[in-house]
């Protein structure tokens, strides 16, 4: 009998040990698995951006240094523009240097000629400030020359060589801007 | 699809703080740009600021210097930290993910700005 119940012991202490061995094998799985999952969601991040294209900006987008730039071939309200930028994964283009401005126009004369393209730049309604759309200031060199005498708020766009203002509410064209992807050779 | 789980609503005093957070799951790779709108009943739902995978953000005039987004690309999530809070920012915010040139919505938090 009690050969019997210490046998019985002896094989439920080994299925615990089994048991045990499982667990630790199902946690380092999971572990293994969350890593994994972390490492996976970065590259796909980094690589679904590029999508089967080493290019640091997407097809039909126009690279400067560490930007890329899209011209709409739309017409839409300021609002509605900022709400296509975001849905490319950008924003409304910040114009930070006179560098840019040029390269910007620059490449508007090639592709489209004299037309006016909203930028990410709105007056605040109180302060009367012209700000960009992440809240920064434009440099003193880069602010709308005053053009529109609207009650309604004013927005700012690019037309030849020049930045302006206008009604938000009016139809233009648009830039979106993004970041390039940096190279990882 | 992307589902989207808000947290972080109330009532606070003008002057005060809140901070909202938006959790996303579901195809999150697919996600261009998350955000926050709000809307005031009767009236369109605009936006207040929006960040980008890239980490480009956007802000409506009226919150610029008050409210600061940020985002959790590794937890997947997007929060909304406001500040100087003013009655007028009273209304329903709700967060947003662009997605495959899709709008995914939360359901919608409340927010109150009374003293």
């Known amino acids: 009998k009690l050969l019997q119940v210490s046998t019985i012991a002896m094989q439920q202490q080994e299925k615990l040990i089994q048991q045990e061995r499982a667990l630790l094998n199902f946690t380092e799985w999971k572990r293994s698995c969350a890593l994994q999952m972390k490492y996976c969601q970065a590259f796909m991040q980094n690589s679904l951006s590029s999508a089967h294209n080493s290019s640091p900006c997407p097809n039909n987008w126009i690279q400067n240094r560490e930007s890329c730039y899209y011209v709409s071939e739309i017409w839409s309200i300021w609002h509605t523009s900022q709400e296509n930028c975001l849905k490319e994964g950008s924003t409304l283009l910040q114009i930070e240097s006179k560098e840019e401005m040029d390269f910007i126009t620059g490449s508007l004369r090639k592709i489209k000629g004299s037309y006016d393209y909203w930028v990410g730049l709105s007056q605040d309604g109180h302060s009367g400030r012209w700000l960009w759309q992440d809240g920064s200031s434009p440099s003193p060199g880069l602010l709308p020359a005053e053009r529109s005498q609207s009650a309604n708020q004013v927005c700012g766009y690019v037309k030849s060589n020049s930045l302006l203002s206008s009604n938000c509410s009016t139809w233009k064209y648009f830039i979106c801007e993004k970041y390039a992807l940096r190279s990882s050779v | 699809q992307v589902q989207l789980q808000e947290s972080g609503g109330g009532l606070v005093q003008p002057g005060g703080s809140l901070r909202l957070s938006c959790a996303a799951s579901?195809?999150?790779?697919?996600?261009?740009?998350m955000g926050w709108y709000r809307q005031a009943p009767g009236k369109q739902r605009e936006l207040v600021a929006a960040i980008t995978s890239g980490g480009r953000r956007a802000y409506a005039d009226s919150v610029k210097g008050r409210f600061t987004i940020s985002r959790d690309n590794d937890e997947n999530t997007v929060a909304l930290q406001m500040n100087s809070l003013k009655p007028e920012d009273t209304d329903v915010y709700y967060c947003?993910?662009?997605?495959?040139?899709?709008?995914?919505w939360g359901q919608g938090t409340q927010i109150t700005v009374s003293s």
């Open positions: 579901g195809s999150i790779f697919s996600i261009a740009a």
């Open positions: 947003n993910a662009k997605a495959d040139h899709n709008d995914y």
